[in-house]
């Protein structure tokens, strides 16, 4: 749709075009399967425009339908990652808070591979915090072209 001249002067955030692209900061301590993310121009090609980070987890600030995408590459990866040497390694993206809205949005398994990637459209609400859980003990790559996570507001 075309934007009016007045709309063109507004920052993207005020138009509802919230968007974020994050890179992996670190994995959690023992018994914490979450991945912790970071973003900002000083870090490279990651950024937050609207959404915010809360202790490494992505929090939505505007209601709407979002495209959620993620790619994770394992730095420790084996052709037997999903067989006898390891329990299957699974990546799950979900709303982890508030608890009343907790739900899994994406679930992927590393089937004899080192990289998984997926995306989906889903409604998200202000205050939703997205968590990315990587089961098992395998370490994900922190290379920014191998592991990244983001959301893009699409429509109300």
């Amino acid at each position: 749709q075309r934007l009016s001249r007045a709309q063109q002067q507004l920052p993207l955030e005020s138009l509802g075009w919230d968007i974020a692209e994050l890179q992996l900061n670190h994995t959690g301590p023992q018994q914490d399967p979450r991945l912790y993310w970071q973003g900002g121009p000083a870090l490279g090609r990651s950024f937050l425009r609207g959404p915010e980070l809360d202790k490494g987890q992505l929090r939505i600030r505007r209601d709407g339908i979002y495209m959620v995408h993620i790619q994770v590459t394992l730095a420790i990866c084996s052709s037997t990652s999903t067989s006898r040497h390891h329990h299957p390694t699974t990546l799950a993206v979900g709303i982890c808070s508030p608890a009343s809205r907790s739900i899994s949005l994406l679930r992927l398994s590393f089937h004899q591979g080192c990289t998984i990637a997926s995306q989906r459209l889903t409604p998200l609400a202000r205050g939703d915090t997205l968590c990315t859980n990587l089961t098992g003990t395998l370490l994900p790559s922190r290379n920014t072209d191998e592991t990244f996570f983001g959301v893009q507001w699409v429509r109300p």
Epitope: H26, A75, I76, L139, R142
Partner: antibody, heavy 120, light 108 residues
Framework: EVQLLESGGGLVQPGGSLRLSCAAS????????MSWVRQAPGKCLEWVSV????????NYAESVKGRFTISRDNSKNTLYLQMNSLRDEDTAVYYC?????????????WGQGTLVTVSS | EIVLTQSPGTLSLSPGEGATLSCRAG???????LGWYQQKPGQAPRLLIY???SRATGIPDRFSGSGSGTDFTLTISRLEPEDFAVYYC?????????FGCGTKLEIK
């Protein structure tokens, strides 16, 4: 300057236990995965174990799984390797090594090593 | 696990000469995730090359790495006296990471 200093090696009988330590300095210890690599006398290098910067996701070589435990104390900038049920074939120089920031298991800094001898 | 075979086992050369060290993998190394280390007697290994061809910090440009798939090479263009040591290759694309058993570079 990155420095890694191992300690705790020595002579131990088969079936015995030993705890190795590695004191790290010169970098933000909690930001990096750390590893143990060993070298038996006159033999090849062998990767032993790795642990993430936050202390989770330990991984082990099949040869030590169930007998060795890697851990770290980020408040003390120290890496540990608890070795139980030691065998003759565990005799080696044990090196503490810093893992590259990417988490890929190549090692940009190494300690000088500590010798573990398992013998009766 | 991926077996790495280094050749030759020993290489006898003189300072000023060039050296070519080979590392062959039993199966393809993921994304050329292969490194080279130098080890002198009584010392810890030192990282020279990672990603098959990237020099580690502080490594002189006479050291270069090349190769992909299963065949990799470390080249030292002009040998200095301090370059005589044992050289190990290591793959880290698949777990467990594995090392070759080394090439000893000795003074002729």
């Amino acid at each position: 300057e990155v420095q890694l200093l191992e300690s705790g090696g020595g002579l131990v009988q088969p079936g015995g236990s030993l705890r190795l330590s590695c004191a790290a300095s010169g970098f933000t210890f909690s930001s990096y995965a750390m590893s143990w690599v060993r070298q038996a006398p006159g033999k090849c290098l062998e990767w032993v174990s790795v642990i993430s910067g936050s202390g989770g996701r330990p991984n082990y070589a099949e040869s030590v799984k169930g007998r060795f435990t890697i851990s770290r104390d980020n408040s003390k900038n120290t890496l540990y390797l608890q070795m139980n049920s030691l065998r003759d074939e565990d005799t080696a120089v044990y090196y503490c090594a810093k893992v590259d920031y990417s988490n890929y298991l190549f090692f940009d800094y190494w300690g000088q090593g500590t010798l573990v001898t398992v013998s009766s | 696990e991926i077996v790495l075979t280094q050749s030759p086992g020993t290489l006898s050369l003189s300072p000023g000469e060039g050296a070519t060290l080979s590392c062959r993998a039993g199966q393809s190394v993921r994304s050329s995730y292969l490194g080279w280390y130098q080890q002198k007697p009584g010392q810890a290994p030192r990282l020279l090359i990672y990603g098959a061809s990237s020099r580690a910090t502080g490594i002189p440009d006479r050291f270069s790495g090349s190769g992909s798939g299963t065949d990799f090479t470390l080249t030292i263009s002009r040998l200095e006296p301090e370059d005589f040591a044992v050289y190990y290759c290591q793959q880290y694309g698949y777990s467990p990471p594995t090392f070759g058993c080394g090439t000893k570079l000795e003074i002729k």
